[in-house]
Amino acid sequence: DFGLDCDEHSTESRCCRYPLTVDFEAFGWDWIIAPKRYKANYCSGECEFVFLQKYPHTHLVHQANPRGSAGPCCTPTKMSPINMLYFNGKEQIIYGKIPAMVVDRCGCS
Amino acid sequence: DFGLDCDEHSTESRCCRYPLTVDFEAFGWDWIIAPKRYKANYCSGECEFVFLQKYPHTHLVHQANPRGSAGPCCTPTKMSPINMLYFNGKEQIIYGKIPAMVVDRCGCS
């Protein structure tokens, strides 16, 4: 189970993980105390044939070709959390692990 | 964490789980002894706005809008295994639990 890594200048057409730094301040998300920025990454690219298909199911659906199925797409297949310090809705400061904030691997599903 | 369920004739435009029966015999996959058919389901539909987004990361990437990011797509967010009896590459009969063969829920990621 592997995935491609690319940089922002890559001409790779296939499904790949690209670097992306999310800047909460730039978004105006002022309820986030820390981090102000973090490396989130994202997935982009084509999912042709059986390249990087995470599940056998993806291949089976492609074979069956039901109505309206648009084929597999490039999406996170492994993600990890980050620790964050933030205000909740009651203005309390919370320190917690927020799941699925970083893309570790991309694939076709 | 929920997902929409649709039938195969539905005109629902949003990301939805549709029924799909996979027939291994019809595919010519004769190395599979049992089951010959199973209910696999599949995901189809549009992922607009923040509808059914599984991860906060999906929304963040949409906000950041990096080059080449195609927006979230409708993909399995919960899958389950099935038990299968099949021939392996050495012509041995194997009974095992094959992961991620059934789509239980669809979402946008």
């Epitope: 109505r67 648009a70 | 004739h9 005109t11 629902e12 435009s13 189809s44």
Partner: antibody
Framework: EVQLLESGGGLIQPGGSLRLSCAAS????????MSWVRQAPGKGLEWVST????????FYADSVKGRFTISRDNSKNTLYLQMNSLRAEDTAVYYC???????????????WGQGTMVTVSS | EIVMTQSPATLSVSPGERATLSCRAS??????LAWYQQKPGQAPRLLIY???TRATGFPARFSGSGSGTEFTLTISSLQSEDFAIYYC?????????FGGGTKVEIK
Amino acid sequence: EVQLLESGGGLIQPGGSLRLSCAASGFTFSSFAMSWVRQAPGKGLEWVSTISGSGGYTFYADSVKGRFTISRDNSKNTLYLQMNSLRAEDTAVYYCAKDGRYNWNYGAFDIWGQGTMVTVSS
Amino acid sequence: EIVMTQSPATLSVSPGERATLSCRASQSVSSNLAWYQQKPGQAPRLLIYGASTRATGFPARFSGSGSGTEFTLTISSLQSEDFAIYYCQQYNNWPLTFGGGTKVEIK
């Protein structure tokens, strides 16, 4: 003003091909599903095909499946219908129609073009 | 496919009178039903969507009702510009299907 303008109709022999175009203006084209609906002379309305806003999903009536292909170019605000293996029964006025997006279902058409006539005859 | 049946095929009404048009679906379409008005030589115009919501540009004398399989379009007091063909259409299931139309003509 929201407008749809079809073109590409004409007289064609059975078995021939034709491509219809529909130029859209006055709305964010890529945000709306688009459809083709036809009307044979003196008859009622018949849905032909629908394509989602992104172009990722397409749907066809059984009567045209495998012969007609719907597509769109969102950069040009244009909808297309490629019609192959044309038959006499395909003779009709072809309307391009915009989805109203009144709920989450495809298929209620709030804006229609003026139509383009396709005649299949030898 | 869902078959949409409209009745009557032709309705002869005097100006100022009430017109009631019926549309029946062969199976439930929930409230995913539209009505269109078509005049000779023109494209159809969306009149009602969601079974009962009037589209922009049509006056309050037009009203739609029903859900499931039985639907009605009512024109409370017919004006000269209302004489046309009216089609119902379901958009609950593929394929999308239209009724055969009701022609509202001057009596």
